[in-house]
C-alpha cells in the first residue's frame, strides 16, 4: 500500500559555515527499505559517493561543506516490492561565508519593553537582493526569515520583530545573498541581543 513520506533533517543544522561538517538524515519506513536523497533542479554528485552502508541507514554525511553542496533537498525510501514513498518535505541546505558580513542593528534601540515590537535593520556594504534574519537560541537551530531589500536598488532589509517577552533570550544574526544563488549566504553579522524590559 501507500508508503508515508519520510522526515529529512540536517545535523547539527541546515545553515552551515563553509568548511564545517553536516549530515543529512532521512528517516522513514521499515528497516528493509532503501533510502534516496536528491537535490531539486540540479543533480548533487556528492550523494553518489556516499558508502552504501550509510545510505541504507538514511545517513548522508558531508565532512566539509562547500558551495557545491548548497541547495534544496528531498528524500524518499522504498523497495522493488513495496514501491516508492512520498518525497519528504524540502530541506534547504545553506552554506554561509560567501561574502563579507552585513551589519545588524535595532531601531530605534535594542532595548524593548515587554510586549513591544522592534525594527531590525540589516545593512550590506555591497548591493544584494536577498537578506535573511535568523533567530538563534541556546539549544535550538536558527529559525530564519528571508526578505528582499526594502527599496529597489537598496542594500538594506527591514524586519519587524515582536511582540517580545522577557521569558527567553532574543538573539539575532542576519545574512545577505544573491537571489541567483539563494543557498549561498554571506558571513553572519555580529550577534544582536535584544534587551527586554519588564
Amino acid at each position: 500500500g501507500h508508503l508515508p513520506k519520510p522526515t529529512l533533517w540536517a545535523e547539527p543544522g541546515s545553515v552551515i559555515t563553509q568548511g564545517s561538517p553536516v549530515t543529512l538524515r532521512c528517516q522513514g519506513g521499515q528497516e528493509t527499505q532503501e533510502y534516496r536523497l536528491y537535490r531539486e533542479k540540479k543533480t548533487a554528485l556528492w550523494i553518489t559517493r556516499i558508502p552504501q552502508e550509510l545510505v541504507k541507514k538514511g545517513q548522508f554525511p558531508i565532512p566539509s561543506i562547500t558551495w557545491e553542496h548548497a541547495g534544496r533537498y528531498r528524500c524518499y525510501y522504498g523497495s522493488d516490492t513495496a514501491g516508492r514513498s512520498e518525497s519528504s518535505d524540502p530541506l534547504e541546505l545553506v552554506v554561509t561565508g560567501a561574502y563579507i558580513k552585513p551589519t545588524l542593528s535595532a531601531q530605534p534601540s535594542p532595548v524593548v519593553n515587554s510586549g513591544g515590537n522592534v525594527i531590525l535593520q540589516c545593512d550590506s556594504q555591497v548591493a544584494f537582493d536577498g537578506f535573511s534574519l535568523c533567530k538563534e537560541g541556546e539549544d535550538e537551530h536558527p529559525q530564519c526569515l528571508n526578505s528582499q531589500p526594502h527599496a529597489r536598488g537598496s542594500s538594506r532589509a527591514i524586519f519587524s520583530v515582536g511582540p517580545v517577552s522577557p521569558s527567553r533570550r532574543w538573539w539575532y544574526r542576519c545574512y545577505a545573498y544573491d537571489s541567483n544563488s539563494p543557498y549561498e549566504w554571506s558571513l553572519p553579522s555580529d550577534l544582536l541581543e535584544l534587551l527586554v524590559l519588564g
Epitope: 500500500g1 508508503l3 534516496r36 536528491y38 531539486e40 533542479k41 543533480t43 522504498g78 513495496a82 516508492r84
Partner: antibody, heavy 126, light 110 residues
C-alpha cells in the same frame, strides 16, 4: 509479483490497438514508474512511455511516441497503451516494465526496471 | 536528445575469460545508468543500477563502473550462461534530453 501483457496479434496498417499490462501480487496503490518498452525483431530496446502511479499521475513519452501512443492507468492493477496509425515499423515485441526508484516526475523522468512482463508480439501487416 | 553508444556491438570470449562493454552518453548522466542482460525470447534482466550497484540476486562477476559520460560493464570468469545481449540504459534527464537504451552488445562464449 509479476506483470503480464495482453495478447498482441496482427493489425492492419493505419489500425489501432490497445495493449494491457496486468499486475499480479501487487497493486498500483503503491507508487511505481510503469513503462512500456518495445523491441523490433532482431533489434534493440526502445522506451515508449511511462506513467507514475503516485498521486501526480504524471506521464512521460519518448519524443517519437508523442501523439500516436497514449499510456494510462485503467485500474489499480492495469496499465494500458493505446497505439494509433500503426505502420510496419511498429512491428515489435511490447514489454511492460516496473521501477520504483525515481526522483520527481518531470525532472528525472524514468528509472531502471527490475520487473518485466514476458512481452507480447504486435505485427502490423496487410 | 541523449544518445547512448554501446561498443562493441558483438564480442566473442572464452569460458573463464573477461569481457568489457562500454557505454558512452552524449551528455552527462551522472551515475543514472543501468545494465541489463537479455536472452532470446526473454525480457531483459536487471544487472546493475546507479552505474555500479549490483541488483539483487546478481552474481558479483558482473561489475559496473563509470560516471558522467563513460561507463563500463565488466563480466569476469565467463560462463556459458553469460551468452546474451547486454544493454545499457540512461534514466537521467527531462523529456527534452530523452531517456533510453544503448544499441546492445551481443556476447558469444567459445
Amino acid at each position: 509479483q509479476s506483470l503480464e501483457e495482453s495478447e498482441g496479434g496482427l493489425v492492419k496498417p493505419g489500425g489501432t490497438l490497445t495493449l494491457t499490462c496486468t499486475a499480479s501480487g501487487f497493486s498500483f496503490s503503491s507508487s511505481y514508474c510503469m513503462c512500456w518498452v518495445r523491441q523490433a525483431p532482431g533489434k534493440g530496446l526502445e522506451l515508449i512511455a511511462c506513467i507514475y502511479t503516485d498521486s501526480s499521475g504524471a506521464t512521460y513519452y519518448a519524443s517519437w511516441a508523442k501523439g500516436r501512443f497514449t499510456i494510462s492507468k485503467s485500474s489499480s492493477t492495469t496499465i494500458t497503451l493505446q497505439m494509433t496509425s500503426l505502420t510496419a515499423a511498429d512491428t515489435a515485441t511490447y514489454f511492460c516494465a516496473r521501477g520504483w526508484d525515481y526522483e520527481d516526475p518531470g525532472y528525472t523522468d524514468t528509472t531502471y526496471f527490475s520487473l518485466w512482463g514476458p512481452g507480447t508480439l504486435v505485427t502490423v501487416s496487410s | 536528445e541523449l544518445d547512448l553508444t554501446q561498443t562493441p556491438s558483438s564480442v566473442e570470449a572464452a569460458v573463464g575469460g573477461t569481457v568489457t562493454i562500454k557505454c558512452q552518453a552524449s551528455q552527462t548522466i551522472y551515475t543514472n545508468l543501468a545494465w541489463y542482460q537479455q536472452k532470446p525470447g526473454q525480457p531483459p534482466n536487471l544487472l546493475i543500477y546507479a552505474a555500479s550497484t549490483l541488483a539483487s540476486g546478481v552474481s558479483s562477476r558482473f561489475k559496473g563502473s563509470g560516471s558522467g559520460t563513460e561507463f563500463t560493464l565488466t563480466i569476469s570468469d565467463l560462463e556459458c550462461a553469460d551468452a546474451a545481449t547486454y544493454y545499457c540504459q540512461s534514466y537521467y534527464g527531462s523529456s527534452t534530453t530523452g531517456n533510453g537504451f544503448g544499441g546492445g552488445t551481443e556476447v558469444e562464449i567459445k
